[in-house]
């Protein structure tokens, strides 16, 4: 009688992970007489994956009746399938023995693979914020991720980006990958409505890539522009100064007026009117009583923006000169008042 | 009881090959794999191979491919390691130990044999 | 290849003190890690498999642990027969390799 063969007819199978994967393994003879095992892998670190005569495996099922006396189909069904299952599976015949069955012969093995989806991209951002014309790097992750082949692009509000770096990790065979990218980023002034965005694509989401974003809303700072300006009003002996602070973001926002270099008022920004591009203006306000004043006055409009060194404006306010007779276009300063705002 | 019989000291002369053996006594030689270790002197330890008894299935770590070969006689239940070319590198002392016929944690080399000492000199 | 570094590589001690020895696996090995003790002699023993699982007849004052890629001996009670050559050992994947050892020295 021709020597018995154990057929593993599927070279190699591809499952995704969470379903059942069915290894097929045949004899070709019922002699000699002895058990099936079957195995992951081979050599001294091999994995006894299910054993027909003992052992408990219970995500291990037999596709036929082993109990039938002239059974020769030793396939079997692996449920929940995870990435970790992954590897070359022998089915493999003992020969009985005493004390113990000996290796008779093996199959030539399967290849499984498992399908695995990368987990959901999480891109985050620089930790402290950057102005406009500066370039910023974001990084974006994602794991879990089986076969390796993968492609990750980047976008800023539509456009691909180009300026990036992405690594898949680990370099050799692996269960599962992960995939690690940096990309670089110029601000611009009209970045506070912006995303970035990275997208990953993968064999296991059929066509229909994952995205992470990040609002460079938690990324930019666009510091204010200040204009300090003055008008004349009603009462004779009174100027009215403005402080402008224009297309400034965050909205954190200080503003001193100091009077001859000594402070005068400090105030926090409160209502602020938000531009198109998602800035913010404000303006400061006071009452000059000229009357109250002998020479002229310094007038300092400075202002701190989000924890930055302040930026300023200083007014020279004449004195001298009939309020009535000041234009309103004199040159721009932050001016302090010694009265209260209107 | 399990045991590991390895044979004795060996003086041998640079060029030449030594072949030692390890004799397994106390369970089924064929259900297990039997490794090779090196140890230099004054140093650590080092795999050299492993070898299935059932089919001469072999397994090698890539430094010793091509200087170490491995054997086995199931009859007798022994295991035997050539070690060729021979340098003053190779003056060691060299352990058998086993591991089940899969990786169970349990049997991982847990029983050695004495060593073999081989001293490599002109 | 799976390098193990093991530290320290020789360490001084007191009967009766508690000493631990500690491999740093370079892959995942998982659990799969053997604690060896060997004799002036050159005889080979295994004291703990499976990272924390005891051999039989070996004394409990031995025992292994992990945290991360960091696996530990520790020997609770040094006696005399203690003061002798320690390896680690991963058997996760092939070429198997050992951790550099470390020589117990009493104080």
């Known amino acids: 009688e021709e020597e018995l063969q154990v057929i593993q007819p599927d070279k190699s199978i591809s499952v995704a992970a969470g379903e059942s994967a069915t290894l097929h393994c045949t004899v070709t003879s019922l002699i000699p007489v002895g058990p099936i095992q079957w195995f992951r892998g081979a050599g001294p670190g091999r994995e006894l994956i299910y054993n027909q005569k003992e052992g408990h495996f219970p995500r291990v099922t037999t596709v036929s009746d082993l109990t039938k006396r002239n059974n020769m189909d030793f396939s079997i069904r692996i449920s929940n399938i995870t990435p970790a299952d992954a590897g070359t599976y022998y089915c493999v015949k003992f020969r009985k023995g005493s004390p113990d069955h000996v290796e008779f012969k093996s199959g030539a093995g399967t290849e499984l693979s498992v399908r695995a989806k990368p987990s959901a991209p999480v891109v985050s951002g620089p930790a402290a914020r950057a102005t406009p014309q500066h370039t910023v790097s974001f990084t974006c992750e994602s794991h879990g991720f089986s076969p390796r082949d993968i492609t990750l692009k980047w976008f800023k509000n539509g456009n691909e980006l180009s300026d990036f770096q992405t690594n898949v990790d680990p370099a050799g065979d692996s269960v599962s990958y992960s995939i690690h990218s940096t990309a670089k980023v110029v601000l611009t002034r009209e970045d506070v409505h912006s995303q970035v965005i990275c997208e990953v694509a993968h064999v296991t989401l059929q066509g229909d890539p994952l995205r992470g974003t990040a609002n460079l809303s938690e990324t930019i700072r666009v510091p204010p522009t200040l204009e300090v300006t003055q008008q004349p009003v009603r009462a004779e002996n009174q100027v009215n100064v403005t402080c402008q602070v224009r297309k400034f973001y965050p909205q954190r926002l200080q503003l001193t007026w100091l009077e001859n270099g000594n402070v005068s008022r400090t105030e926090t920004a409160s209502t602020l009117t938000e531009n198109k591009d998602g800035t913010y203006n404000w303006m400061s306000w006071l009452l000059v009583n000229v009357s109250a004043h002998r020479d002229d006055v310094k007038l300092t409009c400075q202002v701190e923006h989000d924890g930055q060194p302040a930026v300023s404006k200083s007014h020279d306010l004449k004195v001298s000169a009939h309020p009535k007779e000041q234009g309103s276009n004199t040159a721009p300063g932050p001016a302090l008042a010694s009265a209260a705002p209107l | 009881e399990v045991q590991f019989q390895q044979s004795g000291t060996v003086l041998a002369r640079p060029g030449t090959s030594v072949k030692m053996s390890c004799k397994a006594s106390?369970?089924?030689?064929?259900?297990?794999?039997m490794h090779w270790v090196k140890q230099g002197p004054g140093q650590g330890l080092q795999w050299i191979g492993a070898?299935?008894?059932?089919?001469?299935?072999?397994t090698y770590n890539q430094k010793f491919k091509g200087k170490a070969e491995l054997t086995v006689v199931t009859s007798t239940s022994t295991a035997y390691m050539e070690v060729s070319s021979l340098t003053n590198e190779d003056s060691a002392v060299y352990y058998c130990t086993r591991s089940f016929y899969y990786s169970l944690d349990a049997a991982w080399f847990v029983y050695w044999g004495q060593g073999t000492l081989v001293t490599v000199s002109a | 290849d799976i390098q193990m570094t093991q530290s320290p590589s020789s360490l001084s001690a007191s009967l009766g003190e508690r000493v631990s020895l500690t491999c740093r696996a370079s892959?995942?090995?998982?659990?799969?890690l053997n604690w060896l003790q060997q004799e002036p002699d050159g005889t080979i023993k295994r004291l703990i498999y499976?990272?924390?699982s005891l051999d039989s007849g070996v004394p409990k004052r031995f025992s292994g642990s992990r945290s991360g890629s960091d696996y530990s001996l520790t020997i609770s009670g040094l006696e005399s027969e203690d003061f002798v050559d320690y390896y680690c050992?991963?058997?996760?994947?092939?070429?198997?390799?050992f951790g550099g050892g470390t020589k117990l020295e009493i104080n």
């Open positions: 892959q995942d090995i998982g659990s799969r």
């Open positions: 499976a990272t924390s």
């Open positions: 106390g369970s089924t030689f064929t259900s297990y794999w």
């Open positions: 070898i299935y008894p059932v089919n001469n299935d072999t």
């Open positions: 050992l991963q058997y996760a994947s092939s070429p198997f390799t």
